[in-house]
């Protein structure tokens, strides 16, 4: 199996086991029970069988149980992300007992030898909850394991192992290698909890895929298409993060999954919604906007229980940075003509103007071609709330972009030396809002002028018909 | 009160090697990872590498790996740094210090120190 | 490995004075909101004592008159009434990543 370029570590000649000495090495799990908001708190250790420390720190019987699970670890010590999540479970739920699974010794070996340690971890954690079942008012369905990379896994076989179900498994990226297209009980999957709900931010179909590319949950949430994130990319790296190699990036992405949940407990009043959709390319046409019959969700901490019949993939798109809330459109654009159009395809812009603020120009991206009398079908997504809208503004960008249009471009002039104007002829275009479920339709500003050619703009306003709201849920009106 | 209290002062021929132990009290041994220091005559600090002290697995700095070792007795709560084939360059002060597994990893807490003179 | 650079590496200042010692990072050793930079101090023939811990918080028992500031890559040590206790060797150290590493130091003398 191939080892991957450092999921929760920095890529150097680190992957050797570390070198044995006269101290006999444990090969245990730990139970860290966090009990200050304080990250530098040492907390107290759990074990099975001794009661006293759960007297002592005061751990709550009847209150949610989080325990957290690290992955792969190339350095031996917990990456920074783990305090970050500690301090958000903390401030969301201040009641809850938040224990970290420390299973370092075990996961600071080659990715092979700690995959295949993943069992043995899933069996202490499982032995945990066995015990504290033994405890009363201590119920398994207030557990919710929350794992990343490698610890999703972990987290799989603890849900299968435990006597019972346990209430809730979150797959933080879970890790790829060795698990993609695995049995069901060597993964993460459905039946290892109640609810089991999972985030996929680095899939790849090509090259090593860090994380996980197939669903292995009740919900796969796949932001930004699960694999490049924003301001993930490596110029965004080399200015922000400790330094700028390829495996920061991998770092960024593989770890986006993580700050999205954290965002999903500390912004609460600003949730971002994941919609269901059968595969990326259908979501980036923006056919996939609906919230009927549960096709949309919150996502991270706030996400509602869905237990499907199968595996329900959902997508997003996001900021770069938290809170990583964005707001989706639908546009529906019906060219019902064209003229002149040659090889190459328009590059549009659209500029919304809404109550509350106006967006910057939002590129359309044409997934396949624009379809002549027919309704093309886009996703645009804003950061701002831009409230009600009111106007549209279409533009065809005149010069080309790209090397590529340019050849396409000088190849149809030869063709066609004189080249009438292109020229396409578009009467309203349907918007519908991701986040409000709310659809309306805009109509050009003159009834006479529909027609628009390169480095021209064309003006939308609300049809007089325009307000129509259909019978859909809106997401957030579901909010836990 | 926390403290870490180092062996005494060793001079050493070329060759030989030297074992300086730091011995813990006033906290739990086993929930604070154990690291090495190493200050040479008028020189800055430099990290040689760390041991967890539940699990014993070490990790060295790149220039501290191969003649360096680092071993625990968890009954003595005491951490060790042995140091095989001298030279006159490992004349240096040794310090142990101690660092929390969690939060931000600073060394709150440092042995006086163990002066290690190499000289024939 | 993150290089650490102190400026100056030494001054000389009397009683009284306010000091401002810089360190600089390779790359930025913050993660999210926190900066995982610390300074210590360190006197002749002594063990180094920890003064700040992440960029601005200070250790138990250290006097108010030290205090840290930056973030990213930049950080500063302020000693805003320079006391007699107070000349001595002062370090900045990263803890983002393994391995953690130590500025140069700053020697603060008697002028």
């Known amino acids: 199996s191939p080892v991957p370029f450092g999921p929760e570590g920095r890529l150097e000649d680190k992957l050797h086991k570390p070198k044995a000495t006269q101290t006999e090495v444990k090969p245990s799990v730990r139970f860290n029970l966090r009990t200050s908001k304080d990250p530098e708190h040492e907390g107290c250790y759990l074990s099975v069988g001794h009661s006293q420390p759960l007297e002592d720190c005061s751990f709550n019987m009847t209150a949610k149980t989080f325990f957290i699970i690290h992955g792969w670890t190339m350095s031996g010590i917990f990456e920074n992300w783990l305090h970050k999540l500690v301090s958000a479970l903390h401030t969301r739920e201040k009641d809850a007992n938040v224990v970290v699974v420390d299973w370092l010794p075990l996961a600071h070996q080659l990715y092979t030898d700690a995959v295949n340690n993943t069992r043995v971890v899933g069996h202490s954690i499982a032995r945990m909850l066995d015990w504290l079942q033994e405890k009363d008012d201590f119920s398994l369905g207030n557990v919710h394991l929350i794992g990343y990379s490698l610890g999703a896994h972990v987290a799989g076989y603890a849900g299968n192992f435990v006597k019972g179900t346990v209430g809730r498994i979150t797959g933080l990226d879970p890790a790829g290698p060795m698990f993609e297209g695995a049995d069901i009980h060597k993964r993460l999957s459905p039946d290892d909890a109640d609810f089991v709900d999972v985030l996929h931010t680095y899939t790849r179909s090509f090259g090593l895929s860090i994380g996980i590319q197939m669903p292995v949950g009740h919900i796969d949430i796949y932001p930004n298409g699960g694999d490049f994130q924003p301001g993930c990319g490596l110029n965004d790296v080399l200015g922000s993060i400790a330094y700028g190699t390829i495996t920061e990036v991998v770092k960024c992405e593989h770890e986006r999954a993580v700050h999205l949940f954290v965002d999903s407990l500390v912004n609460q009043d600003k949730p971002s919604f994941a919609f269901q959709c059968t595969d990326s390319n259908r979501f980036k046409k923006g056919i996939c906007l609906s919230c009927r019959k549960n096709r949309c969700n919150s996502i991270g901490y706030n996400a509602k229980k869905m237990r499907n019949k199968r595996n329900s993939k959902m997508y997003l798109k996001t900021r770069a940075g938290m809170p990583f809330r964005v707001y989706h459109y639908q546009m529906k654009i019906h060219v019902f003509s064209y003229k002149n159009m040659g090889e190459i395809e328009p590059t549009f812009y659209v500029t919304l103007y809404g109550t509350n603020a106006d967006s910057q120009t939002l590129p359309l991206e044409i997934v396949e071609r624009i379809e002549q009398n027919a309704t093309n079908t886009f996703l645009v997504y804003t950061e701002e709330d831009l409230g009600d809208l009111l106007k549209i503004q279409l533009t065809w960008e005149g010069a080309s972009q790209s090397w590529y249009n340019l050849w396409k471009e000088f190849r149809s002039y030869l063709s066609q030396p004189r080249n009438p104007g292109r020229e396409l002829n578009i009467r309203r275009i349907r918007v519908k809002s991701g986040e409000t479920q709310r659809k309306l339709t805009f109509c050009t500003e003159d009834p006479e002028n529909t027609s628009i050619s390169p480095g021209r703009e064309l003006w939308f306003r609300k049809c007089r018909d325009g307000w129509r709201m259909k019978n859909e849920t809106s997401p957030t009106v579901e909010l836990p | 009160q926390v403290q870490l209290v180092q062996s005494g002062a060793e001079v050493k021929k070329p060759g030989a090697s030297v074992k300086v132990s730091c011995k813990a009290s006033g906290y739990t041994f086993t929930n604070y990872g154990m690291n090495w220091v190493r200050q040479a005559p008028g020189q800055g600090l430099e990290w040689m590498g760390w041991i967890n002290t539940y699990s014993g697995v070490p990790t060295y700095a790149g220039d501290f790996k191969g003649r360096f070792t680092f071993t625990l007795d968890t009954s003595t709560s005491t951490a060790y740094m042995e140091l095989s084939s001298l030279r006159s360059e490992d004349t240096a002060v040794y310090y142990c210090a101690r660092r929390g597994y969690y939060g931000r990893r600073y060394f709150d807490v440092w042995g006086k120190g163990t002066t290690v003179t190499v000289s024939s | 490995d993150i290089q650490l650079t102190q400026s100056p590496s030494s001054l000389s200042a009397s009683v009284g004075d306010r000091v401002t010692i810089t360190c600089k990072a390779s790359q930025s050793v913050d993660y999210d909101v926190d900066s995982y930079m610390h300074w210590y101090q360190q006197k002749p023939g002594k063990a180094p004592k920890l003064l700040i811990y992440?960029?601005?918080n200070l250790a138990s028992g250290v006097p108010s008159r030290f205090s840290g500031s930056g973030s990213g890559t930049d950080f500063t040590l302020t000693i805003s009434s320079l006391q007699p206790e107070d000349f001595a060797t002062y370090y900045c150290q990263q803890t983002i990543e393994d391995p953690p590493t130590f500025g140069g130091g700053t020697k603060v003398e008697i002028k």
């Open positions: 992440a960029a601005s």
